[in-house]
């Protein structure tokens, strides 16, 4: 499995998106886990709602949230108030029974807040093409089931 780097700023939120094949993983709950060492186990941080149909509901564990757009095929994890100790290797997982398939390996890199004088050498301000609101977040559009919408699997 290839690894994707997501970089965020200490003290801010980082949004990680793990795309997947919605057909292949239809009906499966998802999870976010932290890899303990290169060959070690992956320690569960948070998983989607116990009822798969409610996977779009955001679930929190501490400062980490998870939500799943099961139709679009995007699992989104939010790490709130990112801290240096949040840096490291994670996995997005698809669960079936007691098994877990890796959807994506994610390397979270935490960087200093450019406006934090303790870390800043020369001050940096966002240019025209960057804003703090947008710059540190990978946006992904999630949609939940509308009232009365039947959750059929997508057709190819």
């Amino acid at each position: 499995h290839n690894t994707t780097v997501f970089q965020g700023v200490a003290g801010q939120s980082l949004q990680v998106s793990c795309p997947y094949d919605s057909m292949k993983h239809w009906g499966r709950r998802k999870a976010w886990c932290r890899q303990l060492g290169e060959k070690g186990p992956c320690q569960r941080v948070v998983s989607t709602h116990n009822l798969w149909l409610l996977s779009f509901l955001r679930r929190w564990n501490g400062s980490t949230a998870i939500t799943d757009d099961t139709l679009g095929g995007t699992l989104t994890i939010t790490l709130r108030n990112l801290q240096p100790h949040d840096a490291g290797l994670y996995q997005c997982q698809s669960l079936h029974g007691s098994e877990a398939d890796t959807l994506r390996k994610v390397l979270v890199e935490v960087l200093a807040d450019p406006l934090d004088h303790r870390d800043a050498g020369d001050l940096w301000f966002p240019g025209e093409s960057e804003s703090f609101e947008d710059a540190h977040v990978e946006h992904s559009i999630s949609r939940s089931l509308l009232e009365g919408e039947i959750p059929f699997p997508p057709t190819s």
């Epitope: 290839n2 690894t3 780097v5 700023v9 935490v110 200093a112 807040d113 020369d122 960057e130």
Partner: antibody, heavy 118, light 107 residues
Framework: EVQLQQSGPELVKPGTSVKMSCKAS????????IHWVKQKPGQGLEWIGY????????NYNEKFKGKATLTSDKSSSTAYMELSSLTSEDSAVYNC???????????WGQGTTLSVSS | DIQMTQSSSSFSVSLGDRVTITCKAS??????LAWYQQKPGNAPRLLIS???SLETGVPSRFSGSGSGKNYTLSITSLQTEDVATYYC?????????FGGGTNLEIK
């Protein structure tokens, strides 16, 4: 003004090591990853890896593991790359570059030319 | 590793032409694509990141489009200063990889 100033050209013998530097100015050094890119004369670009100056964590292209070692020094806002067991294949221009929050390399150093010859 | 394949390594164009350079990834890179311009003896210059976002100071004649595996860099009306080699680069999967480059030369 953001600048990445790289050390001068190097002419070294096969089997030796070299350490080149990339001094950043004009921005908060620990707030951006610093990457290293190799370019052989008349050829394309090859990503070596990056250093996170905030955490001192690094990440390498498998191809360069054991060849390149990336470090940084926050106090001097400088990133370093050491290349070991040099051969003629390592002769190239090496650039440092900063990656933006959209993951592109928005500022580049001028390059350090490495020549490995006996 | 994700392979990045650029349409052609070199092609001749005329000043004022609309130029389109394509880049195909071996798998979906979810818009984590950048375009660079490099002139002989110089470091590359970032033109576009996130597949479509034009960097500050880059002329508006440059634009980026695409999604999934297929991406395009367009120059609406080629100027003398645009004669260079153009590279695409993905940052979705480690190792980050570049296309082989497309060299524009004047007819």
């Amino acid at each position: 003004e953001v600048q990445l100033q790289q050390s001068g050209p190097e002419l070294v013998k096969p089997g030796t090591s070299v350490k080149m530097s990339c001094k950043a100015s004009g921005y908060s050094f620990p707030s951006f990853l610093i990457h290293w890119v190799k370019q052989k004369p008349g050829q394309g670009l090859e990503w070596i890896g990056y250093i996170n100056p905030y955490s001192d964590g690094s990440n390498y292209n498998e191809k360069f593991k054991g060849k390149a070692t990336l470090t940084s020094d926050k106090s001097s806002s400088t990133a370093y790359m050491e290349l070991s067991s040099l051969t003629s294949e390592d002769s190239a221009v090496y650039n440092c570059a900063r990656s933006s929050y959209r993951y592109g390399f928005d500022y580049w150093g001028q390059g350090t030319t490495l020549s490995v010859s006996s | 590793d994700i392979q990045m394949t650029q349409s052609s390594s070199s092609f001749s164009v005329s000043l004022g032409d609309r130029v389109t350079i394509t880049c195909k990834a071996s798998e979906d890179i979810y818009n984590r694509l950048a375009w660079y311009q490099q002139k002989p003896g110089n470091a590359p210059r970032l033109l576009i990141s996130g597949a479509t976002s034009l960097e500050t100071g880059v002329p508006s004649r440059f634009s980026g489009s695409g999604s999934g595996k297929n991406y395009t860099l367009s120059i609406t009306s080629l100027q003398t200063e645009d004669v260079a080699t153009y590279y695409c680069q993905q940052s979705w999967s480690i190792p980050w990889t570049f296309g082989g480059g497309t060299n524009l030369e004047i007819k």
